[in-house]
Interface confidence: medium
Amino acid sequence: LRLLDHRALVCSQPGLNCTVKNSTCLDDSWIHPRNLTPSSPKDLQIQLHFAHTQQGDLFPVAHIEWTLQTDASILYLEGAELSVLQLNTNERLCVKFQFLSMLQHHRKRWRFSFSHFVVDPGQEYEVTVHHLPKPIPDGDPNHQSKNFLVPDCEHARMKVTTPCMSSGSLWDPNITVETLEAHQLRVSFTLWNESTPYQVLLESFSDSENHSCFDVVKQIFAPRQEEFHQRANVTFTLSKFHWCCHHHVQVQPFFSSCLNDCLRHAVTVPCPVISNTTVPKPVADYIPLWEPRSGSSDYKDDDDKGSSHHHHHH
């Protein structure tokens, strides 16, 4: 969690002199309660916006907007504390709007916004706006919270942001899987335009259970420049047990921008239906998995011939 660095943070508006300050998330009014405190924010909205840094990078940001209630408590409103909590890490970042002048009633409802919290793809946040000073112990709460889920890197608008591109979002491996004779599976995918190694991970399951009955990892060495955008092939020898037939294949790149944390592309090949006419139909998914898996490191580029089913995936 961080603040976008590309411009001075502003909260002043006509009729209000205001400054944005870093906050420890523990306002002084917790420690020294006041007798008169303002009411809570109204109509808190959090939206996904995108913002450029001075360097030209594009980041997803949380756009936070709220209004004030039209009651006399605005006369005691000294500012607001904005808190963003990343739910999976419990990391919290706060800023404080400090009013340098007193709010007056005017014809239009007071509205505030802030668009400088940089958020991460696929993460969920709790956004809270506290009006200051905070209430006395046992007083009515004067904050509002909303949870905010940021789309992941598969979303078209997220794909082109700097954090997504850094994790390989623009690479489309177009994975295909062929089932060959002699208990073999050939995986083919398109290499990206970077001289970087890849891992292809196969995990097999029985149709009836979720437990893995077979797994193997193969390495693909960093391609040369003339091999960029070419197809790479890896052939796996499958488990000898016919019931160990539900295969999950992942291709994990190790791009320089994301190393072990690159987005993996995955394909699932279900067990064949016992029928002469049915071709197993794999289901493609796209899942960010953040820890690499260890395994055997033999690489085989095979041209085995055999009756095959072709499956095309993203």
């Epitope: 996904l48 995108f50 450029h52 949870n147 889920l149 979303h155 078209a156 794909k159 493609a284």
Partner: antibody, heavy 131, light 107 residues
Amino acid sequence: QVQLQESGPGLVKPSETLSLTCTVSGGSISNYYWNWIRQSPGKGLEWIGDIYYSGSTNYNPSLKSRVTISVDTSKNQFSLKLSSVTTADTAVYYCARDGELANYYGSGSYQFYYYYGMDVWGQGTTVTVSS
Amino acid sequence: DILMTQSPSSLSASVGDRVTITCRASQGIRNDLGWYQQKPGKAPKRLIYAASSLQSGVPSRFSGSGSGTEFTLTISSLQPEDFATYYCLQHNSNPFTFGPGTKVDIK
């Protein structure tokens, strides 16, 4: 109610540059993506590209070398320039907004916002490329 | 590019009929798909977004379903004003791509 209006010359000579402007009324151009789409009898509906209000652009790779999309937030307008036109660029050109930010409310105060496609369209303007 | 195909390319139906149009994507697009109706000389109008959500102001006889690669638009009881051309649009990947359209005319 947001409305979009395309404007620009209806006739362009081959090899020249096609220039169109889309004016947004009834709402702000800020915080949305804005698209250009064209429709020709031979090719159906074709997405040309889009621009975010901050100036970030995405183009259709098939047209990228010839397309420039720009935005003028002060005028609530965005524009399309297509260079080196041929008769194949004859089409009805539409501008469109990339969806309202959707908010899905689950239990309590849960929110999920994202862009979900083109919801508001201009009425279209016909551009003929001919000498 | 993601190729969108639609079937049928045209169909003839009567008022009151149930009509189903299918759209297929060449690769998985989750639910990043919209359905549009276009009448001659008019701009496309969105009926369905996110594959199955009804656009505000659109009659409930229109519904959408599907996810991944296969999507369906259903008109439960065709009305005279529904005779038009229907397009699907994927907005999962750049470039966004439309289906070739399905023309619904009067039998």
